[in-house]
């Protein structure tokens, strides 16, 4: 029961996390204009991974997509890649975990197969969460660097008369959504991995050692520790979960991973 709850909760937490990662990736407010010196602006700038926007005091909002690929900073491209990889891995993880849920019966799928699938999805969630956290953190670091650089040369004067005030950007809502979502996906993945341990049938398939006292000589029946070696006959043909290693009669098919980036 606890295993089912842990697995179910892990799935739900991961689902929320991945939804959050998708939301963060699509959001326009990755960086927002710093309003520290001027809390009320006529023109409010904010930027996302895919476009930058302006909200005017008139109430109108206009966005412009980044219609170039080569002209974009390498860091931005890297963040995009990390977020997309995170989403793809998370989506595949969700797909795998649906079939791995203990509460869902699919044909005669055995617990060991479900355990393996749970572990697989758990690892995928962990990597997905890490990708999102890494992506958001890289972007945040980029913002901090640019913030202090633009603060250092806040005004570039033209003969003292004309001032070009650089727009400083600070953390946008998407960063916090991304961090929280990445954390949730990570936690969900860990929960799935924990659940996978409980799903595996923990039976130690030891065979009894028979002692035949024939005089003073002691004879040991051969094949005494067959289960632990993985060789020899396994009469009940039970699959033994050993943290990912599989016995030879166990055929495990993993879904193929396609990264559509």
């Amino acid at each position: 029961m606890a295993v089912t709850a842990c697995q179910g909760l892990g799935f739900v937490v991961s689902l929320i996390g991945i939804a959050g990662i998708i939301a963060a990736t699509c959001m326009d407010q990755w960086s927002t204009q710093d309003l520290y010196n001027n809390p009320v602006t006529a023109v409010f700038n904010y930027q996302g991974l895919w476009r930058s926007c302006v909200r005017e005091s008139s109430g109108f909002t206009e966005c412009r997509g980044y219609f170039t690929l080569l002209g974009l900073p390498a860091m931005l491209q890297a963040v995009r890649a990390l977020m997309i990889v995170g989403i793809v891995l998370g989506a595949i993880g969700l797909l795998v975990s649906i079939f791995a849920l203990k509460c869902i019966r699919i044909g005669s799928m055995e617990d060991s197969a479900k355990a393996n699938m749970t572990l697989t999805s758990g690892i995928m969630f962990i990597v997905s969460g890490l990708c999102a956290i890494a992506g958001v953190s890289v972007f945040a670091n980029m913002l901090v660097t640019n913030f202090w650089m633009s603060t250092a040369n806040m005004y570039t004067g033209m003969g003292g008369m004309v001032q070009t005030v650089q727009t400083r950007y600070t953390f946008g809502a998407a960063l916090f959504v991304g961090w929280v979502a990445g954390g949730l996906t990570l936690i969900g993945g860990v929960m799935m991995c924990i659940a996978c341990r409980g799903l595996a049938p923990e039976e130690t398939n030891y065979k009894a050692v028979s002692y035949h006292a024939s005089g003073h000589s002691v004879a040991y029946k051969p094949g005494g520790f067959k289960a632990s070696t993985g060789f020899g006959s396994n009469t009940k043909n039970k699959k033994i979960y050993d943290g990912g290693a599989r016995t030879e009669d166990e055929v495990q098919s993993y879904p193929s991973k396609h990264d559509y980036v």
């Epitope: 700038n45 930058s52 005017e56 008139s58 109108f60 966005c63």
Partner: antibody
Framework: QVQLQQPGAELVRPGTSVKLSCKAS????????VNWVKQRPGQGLEWIGM????????RLNQQFKDKATLTVDKSSNTAYMQLNRPTSEDSAVYYC???????????WGQGTTLIVSS | DIVMTQSPSSLTVTAGEKVTLNCLSS????????????LTWYQQKPGQPPKLLIY???TRDSGVPDRFTGGGSGVDFTLTIYRVQAEDLAFYYC?????????FGSGTKLEMK
């Protein structure tokens, strides 16, 4: 069509507060900011401030913060500007205007000529 | 506050010629988010309220003849009137829409010879 109607003139004694009106029609009043602009005879234009009819939010030029109070009456689609303790310096034409994209003022009232005289 | 400087203060022209009015801002009016310049041009005839001609530095308002063209970026802007007509004689003002308080230039008076 969009219209901003203002009374032609107001005569007021120095020190007596006056409330100028601007009645909007032909558009959704609560969707656009209403600006107030001052123009003294033979002078340029001076932005006083703006008010948003939906929540009565205001943005005021600091030079007018003690002089002007901007309000709206949604029921009558009217924006108001109250000028406190007017002096001869406040004698001018006061325009109300709607804010458009680019923070530009696309529709203007005909203006109210305020005469401050004893 | 952003200071808007217009030049010349007055200009005498003959019908049919091309006229260029200048507006200099003390600060860049370019918004990084949409790469638009928040500069507006108005025309004001005597006894009338100002009329919107151009916003976003180069976007003509509806109903404005195409002989009016806005240009420039950052701090330096121009309003060009091709083939000036008698009805174009008026005051022309530029306005900063980039930051509060919105500020206007002192205006350029267009006169006929």
């Amino acid at each position: 069509q969009v219209q901003l109607q203002q009374p032609g003139a107001e005569l007021v004694r120095p020190g007596t507060s006056v409330k100028l009106s601007c009645k909007a029609s032909g558009y959704s009043f609560t969707n656009y900011w209403v600006n107030w602009v001052k123009q003294r005879p033979g002078q340029g234009l001076e932005w006083i401030g703006m008010v948003h009819p939906s929540g009565s939010e205001t943005r005021l030029n600091q030079q007018f913060k003690d002089k002007a109070t901007l309000t709206v009456d949604k029921s009558s689609n009217t924006a108001y500007m109250q000028l406190n303790r007017p002096t001869s310096e406040d004698s001018a034409v006061y325009y109300c205007a709607r804010v458009w994209s680019g923070n530009a003022f696309d529709y203007w009232g005909q203006g109210t000529t305020l005469i401050v005289s004893s | 506050d952003i200071v808007m400087t217009q030049s010349p203060s007055s200009l005498t022209v003959t019908a049919g010629e091309k006229v260029t009015l200048n507006c200099l801002s003390s600060q860049s009016l370019l918004a990084s988010g949409n790469q638009r310049n928040y500069l507006t041009w108005y025309q004001q005839k005597p006894g009338q309220p100002p009329k919107l001609l151009i916003y976003w530095a180069s976007t003509r308002d509806s109903g404005v003849p195409d002989r009016f063209t806005g240009g420039g970026s950052g701090v330096d802007f121009t309003l060009t009137i091709y083939r000036v007509q008698a009805e174009d004689l008026a005051f022309y003002y530029c306005q900063n829409g980039f930051s509060f308080p919105f500020t206007f230039g002192s205006g350029t008076k267009l006169e006929m010879k």
